[in-house]
């Protein structure tokens, strides 16, 4: 399987919200003994590769931010938690998965990761992630809402 | 802060099942792989297994014969079970917590279980 | 399985030196390693994860590099307090294993 970004770019305002998002692609093993960890973090361009530092998301560390099968998030705690720092993260039956963040200040610029796990018990983990980047602009240039840009090319959308 | 606690008797007659649990506080034990690995004395580390949240496990097969792994959300316990122990099983047994993808990042202190007749 | 050869077993240095940890799989980890520094009486703590990342509080002196079957652990100036065994674990198959550990002493 796959992760795809439907964007590689969210340009949006100060005090905005915007989600960002991730799909799964390709044949999903729904075996008993295939689970799915999903998850958000910040990161860099690394040296190595892209996503590979896992970075806290407003404090958030990768593990507050996870997500199991196509369910809600797992845990209550994290949930709360995730609320309480402006944020929501949420996934569906069809592969789609997502991160929302509130109240959009310029120090949440910079480059987030999905990450999925494909966990084959008894046998191995397959990871593969997803990167985009945020930028969140303030002043007469910044737009009045988020603009995203399609990883396929560099046609824009504005989304309210 | 999650924290782990493992518990069980110390002294464990050969040929008999050594009986550890492990109990998960300050967090949900409901994500997660929950393992156990240990640690012959003066020796290094070997991991015995782990049970996920969803209640699937895996064993090391050096020992999967002998190795039983259960949890128990309700107590936010896991435990191990390992049958027919002899000598060679003497050892600190740990608990910890392995995150998918990442590594085992909370660990318990620790229990010495000492198998002598 | 993976079998992971740490190298040296033992390494003696005094504090302020520059310690240079090996560890070789049996065949290739992608970057999929981990390490953990362990003290007497002590549960192994996490130090690097995914070859090269630090964990959550672990200090600048500590890093990791590698991928494939070679890699090392570097403490850039050792303080009193990391003299301790190491040990590098992989996760890229299960069962998941560590190597023998490299015991860093005062010199």
């Known amino acids: 399987f796959k992760v795809a970004t439907p964007y590689s770019l969210y340009v949006c305002p100060e005090g905005q919200q915007v989600t960002l998002t991730c799909r799964l692609l390709g044949p999903v093993d729904k075996g008993h003994d295939v689970t799915f960890y999903k998850t958000w973090y910040r990161s860099s361009r690394g040296e190595v590769q892209t996503c590979s530092e896992r970075r806290p998301i407003r404090n958030l560390t990768f593990q507050d931010l996870h997500l199991h099968h196509g369910g809600h998030q797992a845990a209550n705690t994290s949930h709360d938690l995730a609320q309480r720092h402006g944020l929501e993260s949420a996934s569906d039956h069809h592969g789609q998965f997502s991160i929302t963040m509130r109240n959009l200040t310029l120090l949440d610029s910079g480059l987030y990761c999905c990450l999925v796990v494909e966990i084959r018990h008894h046998h191995s983990e397959h990871r593969v992630h997803g990167a985009m980047e945020l930028q969140v602009q303030t002043g007469k240039d910044a737009p009045s809402n988020c603009v995203v840009y399609p990883s396929s090319s560099q046609d824009s959308e504005n989304i309210t | 802060q999650v924290q782990l606690q493992e518990s069980g008797p110390g002294l464990v007659k050969p040929s008999e099942t050594l009986s550890l649990t492990c109990t998960v506080s300050?967090?949900?034990?409901?994500?997660?792989?929950w393992s156990w690995i240990r640690q012959p004395p003066g020796k290094g580390l070997e991991w015995i297994g782990y049970?996920?949240?969803?209640?699937?496990?895996n064993y090391n097969p050096s020992l999967k014969s002998r190795v039983t792994i259960s949890v128990d959300t309700s107590k936010s316990q896991f435990s191990l079970k390992l049958s027919s122990v002899t000598a060679a099983d003497t050892a600190v047994y740990y608990c910890?917590?392995?995150?998918?993808?990442?590594?085992?990042?909370?660990w318990g202190q620790g229990t010495m279980v000492i198998v002598s007749s | 399985e993976i079998v992971l050869t740490q190298s040296p077993a033992t390494l003696s240095l005094s504090p302020g030196e520059r310690a240079t940890l090996s560890c070789r799989a049996s065949?290739?980890?992608?970057?999929?390693l981990a390490w953990y520094q362990q003290k007497p009486g002590q549960a192994p703590r996490l130090l690097i994860y995914?070859?090269?990342n630090r964990a959550t509080g672990i200090p600048a002196r500590f890093s990791g590099s590698g991928s494939g079957t070679d890699f090392t652990l570097t403490i850039s100036s050792l303080e009193p307090e990391d003299f301790a065994v190491y040990y590098c674990?992989?996760?890229?198959?299960?069962?998941?294993?560590f190597g023998g550990g490299t015991k860093v002493e005062i010199k």
């Open positions: 910890a917590r392995d995150i998918p993808a990442f590594a085992f990042d909370i």
């Open positions: 300050g967090g949900s034990i409901s994500s997660y792989y």
């Open positions: 049970i996920y949240y969803s209640g699937s496990t």
């Open positions: 065949q290739s980890v992608n970057y999929y």
């Open positions: 995914d070859a090269f």
């Open positions: 674990q992989q996760r890229i198959s299960w069962p998941l294993t």
